[in-house]
């Protein structure tokens, strides 16, 4: 039995997958910040997790996915205010009793040190210094991401 949050996450991810393929993104759009091969958008307003998820989708992006501790630290370095929390694309899957990224993969327990409980209706937020489990209904800011298309150098044969 999937929770409403899980259903929302799956529905949005599926609808994103169904959309026609768009040309690769070479530069970050206005107001987005580049972090390595990603563009990040830090919201100014606050929303519960599922609205944040949906908002990123309307921007042809997703809630932030963090690959490892290194990426977490670099992302946290972009957060200017100490006390502010941002939703990322990770929530607790009741059916699998584990933290699950919105792309369907599970959290590697070594990647993030989460403060708080792993339980139903829990979603993950990050601050400048920490990673927290919060009720998904909590209204906080959020981070959307777009993947940049790597520019491969063309190799021309000798003329």
């Amino acid at each position: 039995q999937k929770s409403s949050i899980e259903k929302c996450s799956v529905d949005i991810q599926q609808s994103r997958n169904k959309t026609t393929e768009r040309p690769g993104l070479l530069n970050c759009p206005i107001y987005w910040q580049q972090l390595r091969e990603k563009c990040l958008l830090f919201s100014h307003t606050v929303n519960p997790w599922n609205n944040s998820l949906a908002d990123c989708s309307t921007k042809e992006s997703s809630l932030l996915l963090i690959r490892d501790k290194d990426e977490l630290i670099h992302t946290q370095n972009l957060i200017r205010d100490k006390a502010i929390l941002f939703w990322i694309g990770l929530n607790f899957s009741l059916s699998e009793k584990n933290w699950k990224w919105i792309n369907g993969s599970f959290l590697n327990s070594n990647d993030l040190e989460i403060r708080g409980d792993a339980k139903e209706n829990s979603c993950i937020s990050i601050s400048q210094t920490s990673v927290y489990s919060e009720y998904c209904s909590t209204e906080i800011r959020w981070i959307c991401q777009k993947e940049l298309t790597p520019v491969r150098n063309k190799v021309y044969p000798d003329s």
Partner: antibody
Framework: QVQLQESGPGLVKPSETLSLTCTVS????????WSWIRQPAGKGLEWIGR???????NYNPSLKSRVTMSVDTSKNQFSLKLSSVTAADAAVYYC???????????WGQGSLVTVSS | QSALTQPPSASGSPGQSVTISCTGT?????????VSWYQQHPGKAPKLMIY???KRPSGVPDRFSGSKSGNTASLTVSGLQAEDEADYYC??????????FGGGTKLTVL
């Protein structure tokens, strides 16, 4: 280039509902938030509220009980309804793009609304 | 009465610098780095000049700069030009998705 155009009646009777629509051209409405701001003659600006294209709304607390906003992404339009208007609601009403929820980078030219019987 | 306090008027001669202040509280200006400034010429829509305290949109001359200290934000116009004569409004995010404006400052180029 993004352009916004307000439309609606220029005259509204007291106690009736003011209705305005903003049409967005030169870009998709979907990727941003959209706000309404008003300016009484010779006075300053007042933020009325914003709408996200997912349908979520945020309203100025002082106007919240009278304001309704909606969005139609298929028409690239968003709308404002302000009920129970009085002479104090007479103003130029602007629609604006609200990229992150704290500032406005594109504005309509404004729509003058007079409240009179 | 506006939530943010601005001086009603400011003036300067061409080439000079003028600073317009915008004073709020710890619940708006002091609490967030989300202050913006707008220029409005008579009969026209406002134009964004500064956002997020000090960022300038493309097309805005670098003569316009923004800063913040505590609960007060400032807009500085250096090298004043005749076309800078206009009304200037500050705005700030004010928590729980609210937003407030200042009362406006009429800038006169002498």
């Amino acid at each position: 280039q993004v352009q916004l155009q307000e439309s609606g009646p220029g005259l509204v009777k007291p106690s009736e509902t003011l209705s305005l629509t903003c049409t967005v051209s030169g870009g998709s409405i979907s990727s941003y938030y959209w706000s309404w701001i008003r300016q009484p003659a010779g006075k300053g600006l007042e933020w009325i509220g914003r709408i996200y294209t997912i349908g979520t709304t945020n309203y100025n607390p002082s106007l919240k009980s009278r304001v309704t906003m909606s969005v139609d992404t298929s028409k690239n339009q968003f709308s404002l309804k302000l009920s129970s208007v009085t002479a104090a609601d007479a103003a130029v009403y602007y629609c604006a793009r609200d990229p992150l929820g704290s500032f406005f980078d594109y504005w309509g030219q404004g729509s003058l609304v007079t409240v009179s019987s | 009465q506006s939530a943010l306090t601005q001086p009603p008027s400011a003036s300067g001669s061409p080439g000079q610098s003028v600073t317009i202040s915008c004073t709020g509280t710890s619940s708006d200006v002091g609490g967030y780095n989300y202050v913006s400034w707008y220029q409005q010429h008579p009969g026209k829509a406002p134009k964004l000049m500064i956002y997020e305290v000090s960022k300038r949109p493309s097309g805005v001359p670098d003569r316009f700069s923004g800063s913040k200290s505590g609960n007060t934000a400032s807009l500085t116009v250096s090298g004043l030009q005749a076309e800078d004569e206009a009304d200037y409004y500050c705005s700030s995010y004010a928590g729980i998705n609210n937003l407030v404006f200042g009362g406006g400052t009429k800038l006169t180029v002498l």
